[in-house]
Protein backbone atom coordinates (compact mmCIF):
# COMPACT_ATOMS: atom_id res chain seq x y z
CA UNK A 1 0.00 0.00 0.00
CA UNK A 2 1.31 3.77 -0.93
CA UNK A 3 2.93 5.04 2.30
CA UNK A 4 1.15 8.90 2.55
CA UNK A 5 0.08 11.57 4.81
CA UNK A 6 -1.79 14.30 4.93
CA UNK A 7 -2.72 16.10 8.19
CA UNK A 8 -4.48 19.29 8.73
CA UNK A 9 -4.25 22.23 11.11
CA UNK A 10 -4.59 21.05 14.87
CA UNK A 11 -6.35 24.97 16.36
CA UNK A 12 -5.46 23.48 19.68
CA UNK A 13 -1.42 23.67 19.23
CA UNK A 14 -0.21 24.94 22.24
CA UNK A 15 3.70 24.31 22.06
CA UNK A 16 6.37 23.31 19.17
CA UNK A 17 6.67 20.78 17.02
CA UNK A 18 2.96 21.33 15.62
CA UNK A 19 0.42 19.12 16.38
CA UNK A 20 -1.68 17.75 13.10
CA UNK A 21 -5.39 16.50 13.00
CA UNK A 22 -4.44 13.03 12.00
CA UNK A 23 -8.40 11.71 11.74
CA UNK A 24 -11.14 13.86 10.34
CA UNK A 25 -11.94 15.71 7.42
CA UNK A 26 -9.20 16.00 4.59
CA UNK A 27 -6.65 13.72 6.42
CA UNK A 28 -5.03 10.79 4.47
CA UNK A 29 -2.50 8.57 6.91
CA UNK A 30 -1.30 5.32 5.41
CA UNK A 31 1.85 3.74 5.45
CA UNK A 32 3.11 5.79 7.89
CA UNK A 33 2.48 6.53 12.21
CA UNK A 34 1.44 9.83 13.60
CA UNK A 35 2.80 10.12 17.39
CA UNK A 36 3.17 13.60 19.25
CA UNK A 37 3.19 15.94 16.06
CA UNK A 38 5.51 13.92 14.15
CA UNK A 39 4.99 11.73 11.35
CA UNK A 40 7.10 8.57 11.89
CA UNK A 41 8.70 6.65 8.62
CA UNK A 42 8.98 3.05 8.82
CA UNK A 43 10.33 2.26 5.74
CA UNK A 44 13.52 3.65 4.25
CA UNK A 45 13.23 5.12 0.75
CA UNK A 46 12.76 8.37 -1.18
CA UNK A 47 10.09 10.72 0.07
CA UNK A 48 8.25 13.77 -0.88
CA UNK A 49 7.88 16.27 1.91
CA UNK A 50 5.24 19.35 1.82
CA UNK A 51 4.19 21.52 4.48
CA UNK A 52 2.03 25.07 3.90
CA UNK A 53 1.54 27.37 6.67
CA UNK A 54 -0.80 30.26 6.96
CA UNK A 55 0.08 33.15 9.18
CA UNK A 56 -2.19 36.20 9.77
CA UNK A 57 -2.56 38.67 12.32
CA UNK A 58 -5.10 41.86 13.19
CA UNK A 59 -2.29 44.24 13.08
CA UNK A 60 1.34 43.97 11.40
CA UNK A 61 4.37 44.25 13.55
CA UNK A 62 6.34 42.51 11.03
CA UNK A 63 7.80 39.86 13.88
CA UNK A 64 9.84 37.93 12.09
CA UNK A 65 8.45 34.71 10.69
CA UNK A 66 9.61 31.01 10.28
CA UNK A 67 8.58 27.89 9.40
CA UNK A 68 10.60 25.06 9.09
CA UNK A 69 9.93 20.72 8.52
CA UNK A 70 13.13 18.89 10.73
CA UNK A 71 14.17 15.44 11.37
CA UNK A 72 14.46 13.91 14.66
CA UNK A 73 15.99 10.65 15.25
CA UNK A 74 17.52 8.88 18.15
CA UNK A 75 20.76 7.87 16.45
CA UNK A 76 21.55 11.40 15.94
CA UNK A 77 21.90 14.06 18.81
CA UNK A 78 20.56 17.03 16.97
CA UNK A 79 17.48 17.90 14.87
CA UNK A 80 18.37 18.47 11.45
CA UNK A 81 16.34 20.86 9.74
CA UNK A 82 15.06 19.33 6.41
CA UNK A 83 13.40 22.49 5.00
CA UNK A 84 12.66 26.36 5.73
CA UNK A 85 11.11 29.54 5.01
CA UNK A 86 11.72 33.18 6.70
CA UNK A 87 9.46 36.12 6.41
CA UNK A 88 10.75 39.52 7.33
CA UNK A 89 9.27 42.86 6.30
CA UNK A 90 6.23 41.60 4.68
CA UNK A 91 3.35 43.70 6.07
CA UNK A 92 2.40 47.22 6.40
CA UNK A 93 2.95 48.35 10.16
CA UNK A 94 -0.84 48.47 11.97
CA UNK A 95 -2.81 46.53 9.32
CA UNK A 96 -4.78 43.19 9.31
CA UNK A 97 -2.21 41.20 7.32
CA UNK A 98 -2.07 37.42 6.01
CA UNK A 99 0.71 35.69 4.30
CA UNK A 100 1.50 31.90 3.39
CA UNK A 101 4.94 29.62 3.51
CA UNK A 102 5.29 26.55 0.86
CA UNK A 103 7.66 24.03 1.58
CA UNK A 104 7.78 20.76 -0.41
CA UNK A 105 11.18 18.87 -1.48
CA UNK A 106 12.36 15.13 -2.17
CA UNK A 107 14.38 13.32 1.35
CA UNK A 108 15.73 10.28 1.49
CA UNK A 109 14.15 9.05 4.60
CA UNK A 110 15.48 6.19 6.81
CA UNK A 111 12.98 4.20 9.39
CA UNK A 112 12.23 5.36 12.59
CA UNK A 113 12.98 9.11 11.53
CA UNK A 114 10.28 11.34 12.76
CA UNK A 115 9.19 14.54 10.72
CA UNK A 116 8.12 17.74 12.34
CA UNK A 117 6.85 21.17 11.16
CA UNK A 118 7.81 24.22 13.73
CA UNK A 119 6.91 27.76 13.52
CA UNK A 120 8.29 31.00 15.34
CA UNK A 121 5.13 32.46 16.61
CA UNK A 122 2.49 30.04 17.02
CA UNK A 123 0.06 32.83 18.10
CA UNK A 124 0.28 33.96 14.15
CA UNK A 125 -0.58 30.69 12.76
CA UNK A 126 -4.14 29.97 11.42
CA UNK A 127 -4.99 26.16 11.39
CA UNK A 128 -7.66 25.52 9.35
CA UNK A 129 -7.45 22.62 7.19
CA UNK A 130 -6.82 23.81 3.41
CA UNK A 131 -4.45 26.74 4.87
CA UNK A 132 -2.28 25.15 7.23
CA UNK A 133 -0.77 20.85 6.22
CA UNK A 134 1.77 18.78 6.43
CA UNK A 135 2.26 15.87 4.39
CA UNK A 136 4.37 13.24 2.02
CA UNK A 137 4.30 9.86 0.00
CA UNK A 138 6.51 7.93 -1.28
CA UNK A 139 8.24 7.78 -4.41
CA UNK B 1 -0.57 5.53 -18.86
CA UNK B 2 0.29 7.99 -15.79
CA UNK B 3 -2.35 10.16 -15.29
CA UNK B 4 -1.44 13.52 -15.02
CA UNK B 5 -2.18 16.97 -15.91
CA UNK B 6 -0.32 20.39 -16.13
CA UNK B 7 -2.70 23.26 -17.71
CA UNK B 8 -1.27 26.99 -18.05
CA UNK B 9 -3.21 29.88 -17.70
CA UNK B 10 -5.17 31.35 -20.19
CA UNK B 11 -6.14 35.07 -20.52
CA UNK B 12 -9.50 35.85 -22.23
CA UNK B 13 -11.87 34.89 -19.98
CA UNK B 14 -13.64 36.62 -17.29
CA UNK B 15 -15.36 33.49 -15.70
CA UNK B 16 -15.05 31.59 -12.49
CA UNK B 17 -13.64 29.42 -12.06
CA UNK B 18 -10.56 29.90 -13.67
CA UNK B 19 -10.03 28.32 -17.18
CA UNK B 20 -6.79 27.05 -18.79
CA UNK B 21 -5.38 26.28 -21.74
CA UNK B 22 -5.00 22.55 -22.34
CA UNK B 23 -3.79 22.03 -25.52
CA UNK B 24 -0.80 24.49 -26.55
CA UNK B 25 2.68 25.24 -25.23
CA UNK B 26 4.05 23.24 -22.42
CA UNK B 27 0.64 21.46 -21.45
CA UNK B 28 0.00 18.04 -20.13
CA UNK B 29 -3.23 16.15 -20.14
CA UNK B 30 -3.43 12.71 -19.90
CA UNK B 31 -5.76 9.97 -18.17
CA UNK B 32 -7.60 13.04 -17.06
CA UNK B 33 -10.43 15.15 -18.97
CA UNK B 34 -10.32 19.06 -18.63
CA UNK B 35 -13.80 20.30 -18.77
CA UNK B 36 -15.26 24.06 -18.35
CA UNK B 37 -12.11 25.01 -16.43
CA UNK B 38 -11.81 22.16 -14.18
CA UNK B 39 -9.77 18.63 -14.15
CA UNK B 40 -12.04 15.80 -14.16
CA UNK B 41 -10.93 12.56 -12.25
CA UNK B 42 -12.01 9.02 -14.05
CA UNK B 43 -9.82 6.77 -12.09
CA UNK B 44 -10.30 6.67 -7.96
CA UNK B 45 -6.98 7.03 -5.95
CA UNK B 46 -4.26 9.85 -4.43
CA UNK B 47 -3.04 12.17 -6.48
CA UNK B 48 -0.51 15.13 -6.31
CA UNK B 49 -2.38 18.20 -6.61
CA UNK B 50 -1.12 21.98 -7.61
CA UNK B 51 -1.40 25.06 -8.57
CA UNK B 52 0.57 28.48 -8.83
CA UNK B 53 -1.31 31.89 -9.32
CA UNK B 54 0.53 35.56 -10.52
CA UNK B 55 -0.95 38.39 -9.34
CA UNK B 56 0.19 42.13 -10.20
CA UNK B 57 -1.29 45.00 -10.32
CA UNK B 58 -0.18 48.92 -11.24
CA UNK B 59 -0.80 50.42 -8.56
CA UNK B 60 -0.85 48.70 -4.71
CA UNK B 61 -4.37 48.73 -2.97
CA UNK B 62 -3.68 45.62 -0.99
CA UNK B 63 -7.07 44.56 -1.99
CA UNK B 64 -7.35 40.89 -0.18
CA UNK B 65 -6.44 38.04 -2.76
CA UNK B 66 -7.35 34.74 -1.92
CA UNK B 67 -6.39 31.50 -4.28
CA UNK B 68 -8.47 28.23 -3.62
CA UNK B 69 -8.03 24.62 -5.49
CA UNK B 70 -11.59 23.00 -4.83
CA UNK B 71 -13.64 19.94 -5.41
CA UNK B 72 -17.09 19.40 -6.85
CA UNK B 73 -19.01 16.05 -7.67
CA UNK B 74 -22.55 15.49 -7.94
CA UNK B 75 -22.56 13.49 -4.82
CA UNK B 76 -21.93 16.49 -2.35
CA UNK B 77 -24.06 19.28 -2.36
CA UNK B 78 -21.21 21.82 -1.63
CA UNK B 79 -17.84 22.39 -3.19
CA UNK B 80 -15.17 21.40 -0.88
CA UNK B 81 -11.62 23.63 -0.78
CA UNK B 82 -8.84 21.30 -0.86
CA UNK B 83 -6.16 24.23 0.17
CA UNK B 84 -6.30 27.59 0.09
CA UNK B 85 -3.75 30.84 -0.09
CA UNK B 86 -4.73 34.04 1.52
CA UNK B 87 -3.07 37.36 1.10
CA UNK B 88 -3.38 40.68 3.04
CA UNK B 89 -1.36 44.00 3.46
CA UNK B 90 0.98 42.61 1.16
CA UNK B 91 2.34 45.45 -0.96
CA UNK B 92 3.01 49.48 -0.55
CA UNK B 93 0.35 51.43 -1.19
CA UNK B 94 0.69 52.95 -4.82
CA UNK B 95 3.38 51.00 -5.89
CA UNK B 96 3.57 48.25 -8.99
CA UNK B 97 3.37 45.31 -7.28
CA UNK B 98 3.80 41.12 -7.61
CA UNK B 99 2.94 38.24 -5.90
CA UNK B 100 2.90 34.76 -6.13
CA UNK B 101 0.27 32.19 -4.00
CA UNK B 102 1.64 28.29 -4.47
CA UNK B 103 -0.26 25.58 -3.48
CA UNK B 104 0.36 21.60 -3.63
CA UNK B 105 -0.60 18.78 -1.39
CA UNK B 106 -1.85 15.17 -1.64
CA UNK B 107 -5.80 13.80 -1.80
CA UNK B 108 -7.49 10.64 -2.49
CA UNK B 109 -9.77 11.26 -5.23
CA UNK B 110 -12.98 9.95 -6.39
CA UNK B 111 -13.60 9.03 -10.04
CA UNK B 112 -16.36 11.79 -11.40
CA UNK B 113 -14.45 14.54 -8.82
CA UNK B 114 -14.20 17.83 -10.45
CA UNK B 115 -11.22 20.01 -9.62
CA UNK B 116 -11.23 23.59 -10.33
CA UNK B 117 -9.19 26.90 -9.19
CA UNK B 118 -11.05 29.97 -7.65
CA UNK B 119 -9.14 33.36 -7.27
CA UNK B 120 -10.72 36.87 -5.84
CA UNK B 121 -9.62 39.08 -7.89
CA UNK B 122 -9.45 37.76 -11.70
CA UNK B 123 -8.31 41.34 -12.91
CA UNK B 124 -5.36 40.87 -10.72
CA UNK B 125 -4.07 37.36 -12.25
CA UNK B 126 -1.42 37.54 -15.20
CA UNK B 127 -1.79 34.48 -17.18
CA UNK B 128 1.38 33.70 -18.51
CA UNK B 129 1.86 30.01 -19.11
CA UNK B 130 5.41 29.75 -16.64
CA UNK B 131 3.32 32.11 -14.09
CA UNK B 132 -0.17 30.54 -13.16
CA UNK B 133 -0.28 27.05 -13.79
CA UNK B 134 -2.97 24.19 -12.23
CA UNK B 135 -2.10 20.35 -12.67
CA UNK B 136 -1.71 17.02 -10.58
CA UNK B 137 -0.90 13.73 -11.10
CA UNK B 138 -1.49 10.14 -9.63
CA UNK B 139 0.93 8.21 -7.35
CA UNK C 1 16.83 2.80 -9.87
CA UNK C 2 14.49 6.12 -9.21
CA UNK C 3 15.54 8.93 -11.00
CA UNK C 4 15.81 11.87 -8.22
CA UNK C 5 17.66 14.37 -7.60
CA UNK C 6 17.56 17.57 -4.50
CA UNK C 7 20.67 20.28 -4.81
CA UNK C 8 21.17 22.66 -2.26
CA UNK C 9 22.57 26.00 -2.29
CA UNK C 10 26.23 26.57 -3.01
CA UNK C 11 27.35 30.03 -1.89
CA UNK C 12 30.17 30.93 -4.25
CA UNK C 13 27.79 31.02 -6.79
CA UNK C 14 29.01 33.49 -8.51
CA UNK C 15 27.30 34.02 -12.25
CA UNK C 16 23.76 32.54 -13.51
CA UNK C 17 22.59 30.18 -13.93
CA UNK C 18 22.75 29.36 -10.14
CA UNK C 19 25.02 26.14 -9.30
CA UNK C 20 24.32 23.36 -6.89
CA UNK C 21 26.13 21.69 -4.18
CA UNK C 22 25.73 17.87 -5.46
CA UNK C 23 27.95 16.21 -2.91
CA UNK C 24 27.61 17.31 0.75
CA UNK C 25 24.82 17.36 3.16
CA UNK C 26 20.67 16.34 1.92
CA UNK C 27 21.90 16.56 -1.55
CA UNK C 28 20.31 13.54 -3.64
CA UNK C 29 21.40 12.71 -6.98
CA UNK C 30 20.45 9.16 -8.69
CA UNK C 31 20.15 8.60 -12.33
CA UNK C 32 20.49 12.19 -13.20
CA UNK C 33 23.33 14.43 -13.68
CA UNK C 34 24.74 17.28 -12.65
CA UNK C 35 26.58 20.32 -14.74
CA UNK C 36 27.44 23.26 -14.31
CA UNK C 37 24.53 24.09 -12.49
CA UNK C 38 22.23 22.38 -14.66
CA UNK C 39 20.16 18.74 -14.05
CA UNK C 40 20.52 16.93 -17.03
CA UNK C 41 18.22 14.68 -18.13
CA UNK C 42 18.96 11.30 -19.71
CA UNK C 43 15.47 9.20 -20.12
CA UNK C 44 12.32 11.01 -21.44
CA UNK C 45 9.37 10.93 -19.11
CA UNK C 46 7.58 12.68 -16.81
CA UNK C 47 9.07 14.16 -14.13
CA UNK C 48 8.06 16.73 -11.00
CA UNK C 49 10.38 19.59 -11.22
CA UNK C 50 10.69 22.02 -8.01
CA UNK C 51 12.90 24.61 -6.93
CA UNK C 52 12.84 27.10 -3.67
CA UNK C 53 14.99 30.36 -3.64
CA UNK C 54 15.39 32.12 -0.28
CA UNK C 55 16.06 36.28 -0.91
CA UNK C 56 17.25 38.21 2.01
CA UNK C 57 18.74 41.88 2.14
CA UNK C 58 19.84 44.26 5.06
CA UNK C 59 18.03 47.50 4.07
CA UNK C 60 14.67 47.21 1.70
CA UNK C 61 14.70 48.78 -1.60
CA UNK C 62 12.16 46.77 -3.85
CA UNK C 63 14.69 45.98 -6.25
CA UNK C 64 11.58 43.61 -8.58
CA UNK C 65 12.44 39.74 -7.90
CA UNK C 66 12.18 36.46 -10.60
CA UNK C 67 13.32 33.12 -9.61
CA UNK C 68 12.71 30.95 -12.92
CA UNK C 69 13.50 27.43 -13.98
CA UNK C 70 14.25 27.04 -17.25
CA UNK C 71 15.40 24.48 -20.06
CA UNK C 72 17.79 24.45 -22.36
CA UNK C 73 18.01 21.41 -24.92
CA UNK C 74 20.94 21.91 -28.13
CA UNK C 75 17.96 21.07 -30.49
CA UNK C 76 16.11 24.39 -29.70
CA UNK C 77 17.72 27.84 -30.13
CA UNK C 78 16.39 29.63 -27.02
CA UNK C 79 16.00 28.45 -23.24
CA UNK C 80 12.21 27.64 -22.66
CA UNK C 81 11.04 29.02 -19.41
CA UNK C 82 9.14 26.34 -17.63
CA UNK C 83 7.74 27.97 -14.18
CA UNK C 84 8.52 31.69 -12.84
CA UNK C 85 8.03 33.45 -9.86
CA UNK C 86 8.23 37.08 -9.72
CA UNK C 87 8.20 39.95 -6.37
CA UNK C 88 7.70 43.21 -6.76
CA UNK C 89 6.94 45.80 -4.00
CA UNK C 90 7.22 43.24 -1.20
CA UNK C 91 8.83 44.84 2.19
CA UNK C 92 9.35 48.35 3.58
CA UNK C 93 11.61 50.58 2.39
CA UNK C 94 14.79 50.84 4.98
CA UNK C 95 13.50 47.63 6.44
CA UNK C 96 15.49 43.88 7.06
CA UNK C 97 13.63 41.66 4.84
CA UNK C 98 13.33 38.04 3.59
CA UNK C 99 10.78 36.44 1.09
CA UNK C 100 11.00 33.22 -0.17
CA UNK C 101 9.79 32.01 -3.60
CA UNK C 102 8.85 28.33 -4.34
CA UNK C 103 7.89 26.35 -7.79
CA UNK C 104 6.99 23.10 -8.63
CA UNK C 105 5.03 21.20 -11.85
CA UNK C 106 4.92 18.59 -13.95
CA UNK C 107 6.81 18.11 -17.37
CA UNK C 108 7.43 16.02 -20.01
CA UNK C 109 11.18 16.07 -20.00
CA UNK C 110 13.55 14.54 -22.66
CA UNK C 111 16.27 12.71 -22.68
CA UNK C 112 19.39 15.50 -22.60
CA UNK C 113 17.27 18.04 -21.57
CA UNK C 114 19.09 20.72 -19.55
CA UNK C 115 17.14 22.10 -16.47
CA UNK C 116 18.65 25.51 -14.62
CA UNK C 117 17.70 28.14 -12.22
CA UNK C 118 17.99 31.95 -12.44
CA UNK C 119 17.19 34.82 -10.42
CA UNK C 120 17.30 38.31 -10.81
CA UNK C 121 19.50 39.25 -8.17
CA UNK C 122 22.61 36.64 -6.65
CA UNK C 123 23.39 39.23 -4.41
CA UNK C 124 19.94 38.79 -2.14
CA UNK C 125 20.06 35.10 -2.35
CA UNK C 126 20.60 33.39 0.89
CA UNK C 127 22.18 29.87 -0.08
CA UNK C 128 21.45 27.52 3.25
CA UNK C 129 20.61 24.39 2.12
CA UNK C 130 17.15 24.26 3.82
CA UNK C 131 16.25 27.43 2.49
CA UNK C 132 17.79 27.76 -1.19
CA UNK C 133 17.26 24.18 -3.07
CA UNK C 134 16.34 22.61 -7.18
CA UNK C 135 15.15 19.13 -7.22
CA UNK C 136 13.13 17.02 -9.22
CA UNK C 137 12.11 13.21 -9.65
CA UNK C 138 10.46 10.91 -12.54
CA UNK C 139 7.43 9.94 -11.99
CA UNK D 1 -1.75 56.77 -14.29
CA UNK D 2 -5.11 54.89 -15.15
CA UNK D 3 -7.27 57.62 -17.01
CA UNK D 4 -10.28 57.07 -18.59
CA UNK D 5 -11.34 60.09 -21.00
CA UNK D 6 -14.61 60.51 -22.07
CA UNK D 7 -16.62 62.60 -25.16
CA UNK D 8 -18.68 65.64 -24.84
CA UNK D 9 -22.00 66.73 -23.79
CA UNK D 10 -24.76 65.71 -26.39
CA UNK D 11 -27.93 67.23 -27.34
CA UNK D 12 -30.28 64.77 -28.74
CA UNK D 13 -33.96 64.30 -29.93
CA UNK D 14 -36.29 62.13 -28.52
CA UNK D 15 -36.95 58.69 -30.00
CA UNK D 16 -32.73 59.13 -31.40
CA UNK D 17 -29.83 57.72 -30.33
CA UNK D 18 -26.55 58.70 -28.69
CA UNK D 19 -23.36 57.69 -28.70
CA UNK D 20 -20.48 57.89 -26.12
CA UNK D 21 -17.00 57.22 -26.08
CA UNK D 22 -14.73 56.37 -23.15
CA UNK D 23 -11.19 56.18 -24.13
CA UNK D 24 -8.99 53.95 -20.98
CA UNK D 25 -5.37 54.53 -21.06
CA UNK D 26 -2.46 53.75 -18.09
CA UNK D 27 -3.20 50.09 -17.97
CA UNK D 28 -4.49 46.68 -19.99
CA UNK D 29 -7.32 47.50 -21.15
CA UNK D 30 -8.41 43.76 -21.67
CA UNK D 31 -8.43 42.82 -17.74
CA UNK D 32 -10.70 45.27 -16.32
CA UNK D 33 -14.10 45.35 -16.99
CA UNK D 34 -15.84 48.56 -18.28
CA UNK D 35 -19.13 49.55 -16.59
CA UNK D 36 -21.15 52.33 -17.50
CA UNK D 37 -23.55 54.63 -14.57
CA UNK D 38 -25.83 57.06 -15.21
CA UNK D 39 -26.90 60.49 -12.88
CA UNK D 40 -29.96 62.10 -13.59
CA UNK D 41 -30.02 65.45 -12.28
CA UNK D 42 -29.99 65.51 -8.75
CA UNK D 43 -30.37 61.97 -8.18
CA UNK D 44 -28.64 58.99 -7.34
CA UNK D 45 -26.29 56.59 -9.08
CA UNK D 46 -27.73 53.91 -11.93
CA UNK D 47 -26.25 51.02 -12.96
CA UNK D 48 -26.41 50.64 -16.73
CA UNK D 49 -24.17 47.67 -17.86
CA UNK D 50 -20.95 46.22 -18.00
CA UNK D 51 -18.42 45.06 -20.62
CA UNK D 52 -15.65 43.10 -20.58
CA UNK D 53 -12.61 43.90 -22.95
CA UNK D 54 -10.81 40.43 -22.87
CA UNK D 55 -13.56 39.04 -25.06
CA UNK D 56 -16.46 41.05 -25.44
CA UNK D 57 -18.66 39.35 -23.17
CA UNK D 58 -21.14 41.92 -21.54
CA UNK D 59 -24.06 42.43 -18.83
CA UNK D 60 -27.18 44.73 -18.55
CA UNK D 61 -29.36 45.71 -16.27
CA UNK D 62 -32.77 44.87 -17.22
CA UNK D 63 -33.90 48.52 -17.10
CA UNK D 64 -31.78 48.64 -20.42
CA UNK D 65 -31.44 45.91 -21.94
CA UNK D 66 -32.77 46.29 -25.72
CA UNK D 67 -32.02 49.86 -25.22
CA UNK D 68 -28.09 50.45 -24.34
CA UNK D 69 -25.62 48.14 -26.22
CA UNK D 70 -22.08 48.46 -24.94
CA UNK D 71 -19.27 47.72 -27.20
CA UNK D 72 -15.64 48.13 -27.11
CA UNK D 73 -12.71 49.02 -29.63
CA UNK D 74 -9.63 46.95 -28.20
CA UNK D 75 -7.22 48.50 -30.93
CA UNK D 76 -7.84 51.99 -29.28
CA UNK D 77 -9.00 50.96 -25.83
CA UNK D 78 -11.99 52.64 -26.38
CA UNK D 79 -15.32 51.55 -25.00
CA UNK D 80 -19.03 52.70 -25.94
CA UNK D 81 -22.34 53.23 -24.51
CA UNK D 82 -25.14 53.57 -27.19
CA UNK D 83 -28.58 54.59 -25.99
CA UNK D 84 -31.41 54.24 -28.39
CA UNK D 85 -35.00 55.31 -28.32
CA UNK D 86 -34.49 58.07 -25.97
CA UNK D 87 -37.28 60.15 -23.78
CA UNK D 88 -36.77 62.88 -22.07
CA UNK D 89 -35.90 60.80 -18.36
CA UNK D 90 -32.88 59.25 -20.38
CA UNK D 91 -31.36 62.91 -19.52
CA UNK D 92 -28.59 62.47 -17.27
CA UNK D 93 -24.61 62.26 -17.28
CA UNK D 94 -23.32 59.39 -18.16
CA UNK D 95 -19.74 57.93 -16.41
CA UNK D 96 -17.61 55.12 -17.24
CA UNK D 97 -16.11 53.73 -14.85
CA UNK D 98 -13.30 50.82 -14.49
CA UNK D 99 -14.36 47.79 -12.85
CA UNK D 100 -12.36 44.84 -11.27
CA UNK D 101 -14.15 42.11 -12.56
CA UNK D 102 -14.59 39.97 -9.42
CA UNK D 103 -14.69 42.48 -6.52
CA UNK D 104 -16.53 44.65 -9.22
CA UNK D 105 -16.15 47.98 -7.29
CA UNK D 106 -15.85 51.13 -9.56
CA UNK D 107 -11.86 51.96 -8.67
CA UNK D 108 -11.71 54.94 -11.94
CA UNK D 109 -14.17 56.93 -13.36
CA UNK D 110 -14.55 59.23 -16.37
CA UNK D 111 -15.49 62.47 -16.06
CA UNK D 112 -18.88 62.22 -17.15
CA UNK D 113 -20.94 63.07 -20.48
CA UNK D 114 -24.11 65.37 -20.36
CA UNK D 115 -26.53 64.14 -22.54
CA UNK D 116 -29.68 66.26 -23.06
CA UNK D 117 -32.90 64.66 -24.39
CA UNK D 118 -35.10 67.64 -25.54
CA UNK D 119 -38.13 68.46 -28.01
CA UNK E 1 -32.41 43.05 -6.98
CA UNK E 2 -31.08 44.19 -3.99
CA UNK E 3 -31.82 46.97 -2.66
CA UNK E 4 -29.41 49.15 -0.66
CA UNK E 5 -30.99 51.71 1.99
CA UNK E 6 -28.92 54.35 3.18
CA UNK E 7 -29.75 56.54 6.17
CA UNK E 8 -30.35 59.07 7.56
CA UNK E 9 -30.73 61.16 3.77
CA UNK E 10 -28.92 64.30 5.05
CA UNK E 11 -26.25 64.74 8.02
CA UNK E 12 -25.71 67.69 9.87
CA UNK E 13 -22.22 68.03 11.15
CA UNK E 14 -19.97 70.12 12.29
CA UNK E 15 -16.05 69.85 11.43
CA UNK E 16 -13.86 67.92 13.42
CA UNK E 17 -16.95 66.01 14.61
CA UNK E 18 -17.67 61.96 13.71
CA UNK E 19 -19.56 61.25 11.39
CA UNK E 20 -21.43 57.45 11.05
CA UNK E 21 -23.33 56.57 7.51
CA UNK E 22 -25.75 53.13 7.39
CA UNK E 23 -26.41 51.82 4.12
CA UNK E 24 -28.79 48.29 4.56
CA UNK E 25 -29.37 45.55 1.86
CA UNK E 26 -32.39 44.10 1.56
CA UNK E 27 -30.23 40.68 1.79
CA UNK E 28 -27.29 39.18 2.82
CA UNK E 29 -24.31 40.84 0.18
CA UNK E 30 -21.69 38.78 2.46
CA UNK E 31 -19.52 35.34 1.72
CA UNK E 32 -17.56 33.42 3.84
CA UNK E 33 -14.80 35.16 2.29
CA UNK E 34 -15.30 38.81 2.03
CA UNK E 35 -18.55 41.70 2.03
CA UNK E 36 -19.46 42.98 -1.37
CA UNK E 37 -20.04 46.49 -0.44
CA UNK E 38 -17.98 49.82 -1.24
CA UNK E 39 -18.56 53.36 -0.60
CA UNK E 40 -17.73 56.57 -2.90
CA UNK E 41 -17.67 60.06 -2.28
CA UNK E 42 -18.95 61.97 -4.75
CA UNK E 43 -18.78 66.30 -4.75
CA UNK E 44 -20.96 68.47 -6.97
CA UNK E 45 -19.84 68.35 -11.06
CA UNK E 46 -17.28 65.74 -10.48
CA UNK E 47 -17.38 61.74 -10.25
CA UNK E 48 -17.72 59.72 -7.38
CA UNK E 49 -14.44 58.36 -6.03
CA UNK E 50 -14.12 54.97 -4.46
CA UNK E 51 -13.63 55.32 -0.51
CA UNK E 52 -13.87 51.40 0.98
CA UNK E 53 -14.49 48.50 -0.55
CA UNK E 54 -14.71 45.33 0.39
CA UNK E 55 -16.70 47.04 3.63
CA UNK E 56 -13.58 47.97 5.38
CA UNK E 57 -10.81 48.07 3.00
CA UNK E 58 -9.61 51.37 2.62
CA UNK E 59 -8.56 52.62 -1.20
CA UNK E 60 -4.88 53.63 -1.97
CA UNK E 61 -4.42 57.48 -1.18
CA UNK E 62 -7.72 57.96 0.70
CA UNK E 63 -6.91 59.43 4.18
CA UNK E 64 -7.12 56.91 6.67
CA UNK E 65 -9.99 58.99 8.79
CA UNK E 66 -12.31 57.11 6.46
CA UNK E 67 -13.41 53.33 7.58
CA UNK E 68 -15.58 50.73 7.09
CA UNK E 69 -17.22 47.95 8.62
CA UNK E 70 -20.46 45.68 8.86
CA UNK E 71 -21.16 42.28 7.36
CA UNK E 72 -24.48 40.79 6.39
CA UNK E 73 -26.77 43.32 5.43
CA UNK E 74 -26.19 45.98 7.38
CA UNK E 75 -22.85 48.59 6.87
CA UNK E 76 -21.07 51.41 8.24
CA UNK E 77 -19.03 53.95 6.81
CA UNK E 78 -17.23 56.69 9.74
CA UNK E 79 -15.41 59.63 9.13
CA UNK E 80 -13.51 59.61 12.42
CA UNK E 81 -13.34 63.90 12.67
CA UNK E 82 -14.59 65.22 9.41
CA UNK E 83 -12.91 68.08 7.31
CA UNK E 84 -14.12 70.85 5.16
CA UNK E 85 -13.29 68.48 2.21
CA UNK E 86 -15.47 66.26 3.95
CA UNK E 87 -18.58 67.56 2.52
CA UNK E 88 -20.07 65.91 -0.01
CA UNK E 89 -22.46 62.79 -0.38
CA UNK E 90 -21.92 59.27 0.13
CA UNK E 91 -23.20 56.22 -1.53
CA UNK E 92 -22.69 52.64 -0.73
CA UNK E 93 -22.73 50.28 -3.37
CA UNK E 94 -23.07 46.17 -3.55
CA UNK E 95 -21.62 43.84 -6.15
CA UNK E 96 -23.12 40.34 -5.09
CA UNK E 97 -24.57 39.70 -8.23
CA UNK E 98 -26.44 41.70 -11.04
CA UNK E 99 -27.56 44.26 -11.37
CA UNK E 100 -25.13 46.33 -9.27
CA UNK E 101 -27.10 48.65 -7.35
CA UNK E 102 -26.53 52.06 -5.31
CA UNK E 103 -27.90 53.97 -2.26
CA UNK E 104 -30.20 56.67 -3.03
CA UNK E 105 -26.43 58.61 -0.63
CA UNK E 106 -26.23 60.40 2.29
CA UNK E 107 -25.49 64.19 2.12
CA UNK E 108 -23.01 65.25 4.56
CA UNK E 109 -23.27 68.93 5.48
CA UNK E 110 -21.83 71.54 7.47
CA UNK E 111 -23.94 72.25 10.97
Known amino acids: LRKVAHLTGKSNSRSMPLEWEDTYGIVLLSGVKYKKGGLVINETGLYFVYSKVYFRGQSCNNLPLSHKVYMRNSKYPQDLVMMEGKMMSYCTTGQMWARSSYLGAVFNLTSADHLYVNVSELSLVNFEESQTFFGLYKL | LRKVAHLTGKSNSRSMPLEWEDTYGIVLLSGVKYKKGGLVINETGLYFVYSKVYFRGQSCNNLPLSHKVYMRNSKYPQDLVMMEGKMMSYCTTGQMWARSSYLGAVFNLTSADHLYVNVSELSLVNFEESQTFFGLYKL | LRKVAHLTGKSNSRSMPLEWEDTYGIVLLSGVKYKKGGLVINETGLYFVYSKVYFRGQSCNNLPLSHKVYMRNSKYPQDLVMMEGKMMSYCTTGQMWARSSYLGAVFNLTSADHLYVNVSELSLVNFEESQTFFGLYKL | QVQLVQSGAEVKKPGSSVKVSCKASGYTFTRFDISWVRQAPGQGLEWMGWIFPGDGSSQYNENFKGRATITTDKSTSTAYMELSSLRSEDTAVYFC????????????WGQGTLVTVSS | EIVMTQSPATLSVSPGERATLSCRASKSVSTSDFSYIHWYQQKPGQPPRLLIYLASHLESGIPARFSGSGSGTEFTLTISSLQSEDFAVYYCQHSRELPRTFGQGTKVEIK
Open chain 4, 97 to 108: ARSLISTAMFDH
